[in-house]
Amino acid sequence: SGTTNTVAAYNLTWKSTNFKTILEWEPKPVNQVYTVQISTKSGDWKSKCFYTTDTECDLTDEIVKDVKQTYLARVFSYPAGNVESTGSAGEPLYENSPEFTPYLETNLGQPTIQSFEQVGTKVNVTVEDERTLVRKNGTFLTLRQVFGKDLIYTLYYWKSSSSGKKTAKTNTNEFLIDVDKGENYCFSVQAVIPSRTVNRKSTDSPVECMGQEKGEFRE
């Protein structure tokens, strides 16, 4: 039988990339467990991660039901074993998370250059359209299908022999750029949602250079 009182969770933080969404909190539990609830502003509280000793809970399954909704989570603390609870009048201790709107706030994952193809003095660069965990009619949607024209990609490209970078933008997943014949170029892309106020840009993709496996060259 213990005497350590139950404490409320704190530092509730949303960690979300391409809609994969995890709620994290502190402290590591001592003689207590947690249960998480999630709700939309107009919806009901749904419990997840029951009686867990983890300090994180994957809420992806709930938020992908409607990524444009605003969600709130709360973390309940319950005494483990025969430990006293500090809740007043038998009410359980809980702490609310900040609000979270996946469509506006999920981080954009690092993009990947799928391929590039040179035809004469033109190069077509294709960005991989990553699949998300957002479903529609039973199938998983890609990032482009979720964000549509809200999502743009910025291409950074430069001659292998120099450091001067050029940029191009597209609201599809393809770029068609002019290059100098006989020169090798390197490419990196970044996902951007210009309309956002936070988490507007992804990290840059890995650099891909002509003359390596991903490229194709045709006269």
């Epitope: 009901d44 749904k46 009686y51 483990a80 074993g81 359980p92």
Partner: antibody, heavy 121, light 107 residues
Framework: QVQLVQSGAEVKKPGASVKVSCKAS????????MHWVRQAPGQGLEWMGI????????VYAQKFQGRVTMTRDTSTSTVYMELSSLRSEDTAVYYC??????????????WGQGTMVTVSS | DIQMTQSPSSLSASVGDRVTITCQAS??????LNWYQQKPGKAPKLLIY???NLETGVPSRFSGSRSGTDFTFTISSLQPEDIATYYC?????????FGGGTKVEIK
């Protein structure tokens, strides 16, 4: 097949303690929570608490806090429920029930056969 | 604690009848509700989980639905082997709680 086998009936005096066992077989013991539920004669079902067999963490209904202790022995895939300071109103059938799979969160999909505990002076 | 008010407490119906049992939660429990069948002298058996999902191996004449805090359990065509007591159980809030039960008998 998946089953939970409980220990036999007990008769106890008021103030005594009883310890009921529940042996699991046919599945990975550590992967599912175990619950204890009791049923007084002619009455409904009452949840007592839960034990996570992988770490031994327990959570009890407040009504039983301080009187109940749930433990487990991973080497024999057995969980135990001990209830102390027995009184006549603790006379009931005590069930262990498996729960906590990812599909059916806290639904009790497998039950023990029940252990009748009679508290009488 | 969340109160689960189950009604009726007992009912008598004929073989082939449609039987409906309701369970009302004292506050919002989302779809975190299960239904069990308990035959005399036996342990309960899970029939429906998460308000409307049929447990594997359970006959399709059993079904469940939700409307807000009201939950309905239906036997579409009562069979003699369905004589039992039926319980709802919520798990959205600690502690987990059961309804008082509905005893189903054959006329």
């Amino acid at each position: 097949q998946v089953q939970l086998v409980q220990s036999g009936a007990e008769v106890k005096k008021p103030g005594a303690s009883v310890k009921v066992s529940c042996k699991a077989s046919g599945y990975t013991f550590a992967n599912y929570y175990m619950h204890w539920v009791r049923q007084a004669p002619g009455q409904g079902l009452e949840w007592m608490g839960i034990i996570n067999p992988s770490g031994g963490i327990t959570v009890y209904a407040q009504k039983f806090q301080g009187r109940v202790t749930m433990t487990r022995d991973t080497s024999t895939s057995t969980v135990y429920m001990e209830l102390s300071s027995l009184r006549s109103e603790d006379t009931a059938v005590y069930y262990c029930a498996r729960g906590g799979s990812k599909v059916a969160a806290l639904a009790f999909d497998i039950w023990g056969q029940g252990t009748m505990v009679t508290v009488s002076s | 604690d969340i109160q689960m008010t189950q009604s009726p407490s007992s009912l008598s119906a004929s073989v082939g009848d449609r039987v409906t049992i309701t369970c009302q939660a004292s506050q919002d429990i989302s779809n975190s509700l299960n239904w069990y069948q308990q035959k005399p002298g036996k342990a309960p058996k899970l029939l429906i989980y998460d308000a409307s999902n049929l447990e594997t191996g359970v006959p399709s004449r059993f079904s469940g639905s939700r409307s807000g805090t009201d939950f309905t359990f239906t036997i579409s065509s009562l069979q003699p082997e369905d004589i039992a007591t039926y319980y709802c159980q919520q798990y959205n809030f600690h502690p987990l709680t059961f309804g008082g039960g509905t005893k189903v008998e054959i006329k």
